[in-house]
């Protein structure tokens, strides 16, 4: 981003108020809905996109779970509580006073209940997995050329640190994209997974947060790889808590 | 070229004011801020204030508000720094500086400086 | 306020030396530091931004790198025009503060 006023935008983050007043002239941009400054050379958090983003029509989806303890988000679109660092408060809560917890991506983890719910930590979502299933193509793509395009992509599109991408499996049409990252792996400045899962699922429905990008425009040895569909599945630190009604 | 031209020096009497200017050329004086930065003798660089001149929005470190303005006239491209109740601690150097285009918060353009002598 | 700490605080070294100045800041400043070059009676002159970028018409010797609270300002070989003092700043929070300076002295 730059100083001069008609040029002070933030590249990560189009969802975002930016001028040249910060610190000796700086140009500081502020995410829409919390007014919170953002750190424009990495991904803005989940949260903080999430409420900028908080008009936007409901977008529900229901998933096939991989196992018993992985998390979709059913829920959709919700106007989340963010604490200053921008990450998902442990509870959230609606206007109705109905309250649940959320993982560290902001997926809902436990039963709804009232004001009197407690959310003692905020558990880390340490496992995503990513399902894509790819448009009809003249041929299945090489895997180690989608494995290496794929990683690419994460690393310099999203930043995030090739050493979180366990990954990536493919059985035409489906392409699956596994990202790990426990508490004691991630350092000071590295990407979280929960964002980079939420730009690339975001840049996949064509509905790019990067300032004046291009759309994903992603390509395997000159073959346009066009998703069809997107499935992310979250695993958590701590199995989730939901009682046995929601099971059934 | 891009620069900026301060005033020259000036001898004031213990708690009187000082208004020292900062002509920008060669770049649209309203898309950058001008920051005020001061060097007493043998000392290090101090910050003072900035101000957005089209906005119009300032900053001032807390040592100096109360008695430092900074304002800019538009029309002359021109920057002003204020000191009142001047006292001998004041007697330093004073800089107008431009943050970079990259919009860092780095300094890359400075003016040559304006030597500010209080002393009765 | 944030405070910016150099060290050391002067330094003798020769023409060709490799010479490293540290800047350390008491809360942590993201990439938000610049570094300065001055020579007596000038102003200031930028040497890196964003403390990694090298400033446009600065020569490649110098080199910046750090994030957080601990930062480092490299000259690879020292030429004669570098023996001057040398001022870490930060942007991170207002007020914007500067280092306490390094004297860079001819041994």
């Known amino acids: 981003h730059t100083a001069a006023q008609d040029n002070c935008t933030c590249p990560t983050n189009k969802m975002t108020v930016c001028s040249p007043d910060g610190p000796g002239g700086r140009c500081q941009c502020r995410a829409l809905g919390s007014g919170v400054a953002v750190d424009c050379s990495t991904l803005t958090s989940k949260c903080l996109l999430l409420k900028a983003r908080m008009s936007a029509p409901k977008n529900a989806r229901t998933l096939v779970r991989p196992n018993e303890h992985a998390l979709v988000d059913n829920d959709g679109l919700y106007d989340p509580d963010c604490d200053p660092e921008g990450r998902f408060k442990a509870r959230q809560c609606n206007q109705t006073s109905v309250c649940w917890c959320v993982n560290s991506v902001g997926v809902r983890r436990t039963d709804k209940g009232d004001l009197s719910l407690r959310c003692d930590e905020l558990v880390r979502t340490h496992h995503i997995l990513i399902d894509l299933r790819h448009r009809p193509t003249a041929g299945a793509f090489n895997h180690s050329d989608l494995d290496a395009e794929l990683r690419r992509l994460f690393r310099e599109r999203y930043r995030l640190h090739p050493k979180f991408v366990a990954a990536v499996h493919y059985e035409q049409p489906t392409i699956q994209i596994e990202l790990r990252q426990n508490t004691s792996q991630k350092a000071a400045g590295d990407v979280d997974i929960g964002d980079a899962a939420y730009y690339f699922e975001r840049d996949v429905k064509g509905e790019s947060l990067f300032q004046g990008r291009g759309g994903l425009d992603l390509r395997v040895r000159g073959e346009p790889l066009q998703v069809e569909r997107t499935l992310i599945y979250y695993l958590d630190e701590i199995p989730p808590k939901f009682s046995m009604k929601r099971l059934t | 070229q891009v620069q900026l031209v301060q005033s020259g020096a000036e001898v004031k009497k213990p708690g009187a004011s000082v208004k020292v200017s900062c002509k920008a050329s060669?770049?649209?004086?309203?898309?950058?801020?001008i920051n005020w930065v001061r060097q007493a003798t043998g000392r290090g660089l101090e910050w003072m204030g900035w101000m957005n001149p089209r906005s119009g929005n300032t900053g001032y470190a807390q040592k100096f508000q109360g008695r430092v303005t900074i304002t800019a006239d538009e029309s002359t491209s021109t920057a002003y720094m204020e000191l009142s109740s001047l006292r001998s601690e004041d007697t330093a150097v004073y800089y107008c500086?431009?943050?970079?285009?990259?919009?860092?918060?780095?300094?890359?353009?400075w003016g040559q400086g304006t030597m500010v002598t209080v002393s009765s | 306020d944030i405070q910016l700490t150099q060290s050391p605080s002067s330094v003798s070294a020769s023409v060709g030396d490799r010479v490293t100045i540290t800047c350390r800041a008491s809360q942590g400043i993201s990439s938000w530091l610049a570094w300065y070059r001055q020579k007596p009676g000038k102003a200031p002159k930028l040497l890196i931004y964003?403390?990694?970028s090298l400033q446009s018409g600065v020569p490649s010797r110098f080199s910046g790198s750090g994030s957080g609270t601990d930062f480092t300002l490299t000259i690879s070989s020292l030429q004669p025009e570098d023996f001057a003092t040398y001022y870490c700043q930060q942007a991170n929070s207002f007020p914007v503060t500067f280092g306490q300076g390094t004297r860079l002295e001819i041994k």
């Open positions: 964003r403390a990694r």
């Open positions: 500086a431009r943050p970079n285009t990259g919009g860092d918060g780095a300094f890359d353009i």
């Open positions: 060669g770049y649209t004086f309203t898309n950058y801020g």
